[in-house]
């Protein structure tokens, strides 16, 4: 019933049906910061721990503009990329290129997205067209996930679920064009 998965000629790589295309990785004005995150207490022995929270994961920060067709976001967004091998927090180097990666000979721990957030961005379009907005889904944090030989790549999707929250109160809207005025960018995590 749905379309088949398909990679198109445009600037997006198309995921499977039912997922949204992520914005293309156009890293204009790219600022990259790197930090080790999600560390816990050091394990007694690197191969004996069963607590994933004891492993640390690398989060790279990228700043880019969101584009859609001929439009570009008024401001850049900052997103995380989960990177690298997971190892005990105390053994991970603090920066890329320093120290050695800790590579476990035991179970495979992968650094994958833990939580996502949606950010609303105002798009600036040529020709003075109507104001438009887009919501982009960005990684909010990364985690170490233990992968056994029974896991497959679909584990890496592992999208977080959000706790139900009551809706914010609605403000009365006398005019229809609040998208123009509403430049607020929303960063609620889930």
């Amino acid at each position: 019933q749905g379309w088949q998965a398909f990679k198109n000629d445009a600037t997006e790589i198309i995921p499977e049906l039912g997922e949204y295309p992520e914005p293309p990785p156009e890293l204009e004005n790219n600022k990259t910061m790197n930090r080790a995150e999600n560390g816990g207490r050091p394990p007694h022995h690197p191969f004996e721990t069963k607590d994933v929270s004891e492993y640390s994961c690398r989060e790279l920060h990228f700043t880019r503009y969101v584009t859609d067709g001929p439009c570009r976001s008024a401001k850049p967004v900052t997103e995380l990329v989960c990177s690298g091998q997971c190892g005990p927090a105390r053994l991970l180097p603090n920066a890329i290129g320093r120290g050695k990666w800790w590579r476990p000979s035991g179970p495979d721990f992968r650094c994958i997205p833990d939580r996502y957030r949606a950010q609303r961005v105002q798009l600036l379009c040529p020709g003075g067209e109507a104001p438009r907005a887009r919501k982009v889904r960005l990684v909010a944090s990364c985690k170490c996930k233990r992968l056994t030989r029974f896991h497959n790549q679909s584990e890496l999707k592992d999208f977080g679920t959000e706790a139900a929250r009551p809706q914010k109160g609605r403000k009365p809207r006398p005019r229809a064009r609040s998208a123009k005025a509403n430049q607020a960018e929303l960063e609620n995590a889930y």
């Epitope: 949204y20 001929p70 949606a118 067209e129 109507a130 907005a133 919501k135 889904r137 809207r173």
Partner: antibody, heavy 118, light 107 residues
Framework: QVQLVQSGAEVKKPGASVKVSCKVS????????QHWVRQAPGKGLEWMGW????????EYASKFQGRVTMTEDTSTDTAYMELSSLRSEDTAVYYC???????????WGQGTTVTVSS | DIQMTQSPSSLSASVGDRVTITCKAS??????VAWYQQKPGKAPKLLIY???TRWTGVPSRFSGSGSGTDFTLTISSLQPEDFATYYC?????????FGGGTKVEIK
């Protein structure tokens, strides 16, 4: 898998109101824009408006301004469209749709038939 | 409101045919045009946006072109599942408007 499931058909009298629901699954409703589009029997598509469930921001087509209200319950990932002061020309299939933008309709519900008849 | 005029309103074609549907805007809409496919009793499906960008998983036989006021949806080789009604939509200026539709029928 993104799915939008709408409430069942309604028959209303002129002057009454109708409230159509749209249950979204596959992602949190507040992370997208919710749209409503209608289609009169044998006719084309007509955009009614969009809402941003995250902050309750709405944009209505001028034709429906003052008669339509779009709301959401983010705890149940359900969108609602209420149309008041119904007239016979409001007889149509009402579709909810969702999208990551305010201007295109990425995924659609199955439609809800609303019949306005005295 | 910007008017979107589609032509033809209906056409008959055979499997394997190349089909072209046109949409004319009453004023310049740049490339802010989307195309949808609708089958009887079903909801529409997004095919093309920004005049020429295919939506998720849409087969490559569907292509869109145009800018300004004249837009085209082309199906390079019509398949049995392509018999449906096609609508263009502009999103250059509020409120968003659709064309009247083009019904593609089996010859």
């Amino acid at each position: 898998q993104v799915q939008l499931v709408q409430s069942g058909a309604e028959v209303k009298k002129p002057g009454a109101s109708v409230k159509v629901s749209c249950k979204v699954s596959g992602f949190p409703i507040k992370h997208h824009f919710q749209h409503w589009v209608r289609q009169a029997p044998g006719k084309g598509l007509e955009w009614m408006g969009w809402s941003d469930p995250e902050i309750g921001d709405t944009e209505y087509a001028s034709k429906f301004q003052g008669r339509v209200t779009m709301t959401e319950d983010t705890s149940t990932d359900t969108a609602y469209m209420e149309l008041s002061s119904l007239r016979s020309e409001d007889t149509a299939v009402y579709y909810c749709a969702t999208g990551d933008t305010t201007y295109k309709f990425d995924f659609w519900g199955q439609g809800t038939t609303v019949t306005v008849s005295s | 409101d910007i008017q979107m005029t589609q032509s033809p309103s209906s056409l008959s074609a055979s499997v394997g045919d190349r089909v072209t549907i046109t949409c004319k805007a009453s004023q310049d809409v740049h490339t802010a045009v989307a195309w949808y496919q609708q089958k009887p009793g079903k909801a529409p499906k997004l095919l093309i946006y920004w005049a020429s960008t295919r939506w998720t998983g849409v087969p490559s036989r569907f292509s869109g072109s145009g800018s300004g006021t004249d837009f085209t949806l082309t199906i390079s080789s019509l398949q049995p599942e392509d018999f449906a009604t096609y609508y263009c939509q502009q999103y250059s200026d509020y409120h968003w408007t659709f064309g009247g539709g083009t019904k593609v029928e089996i010859k």
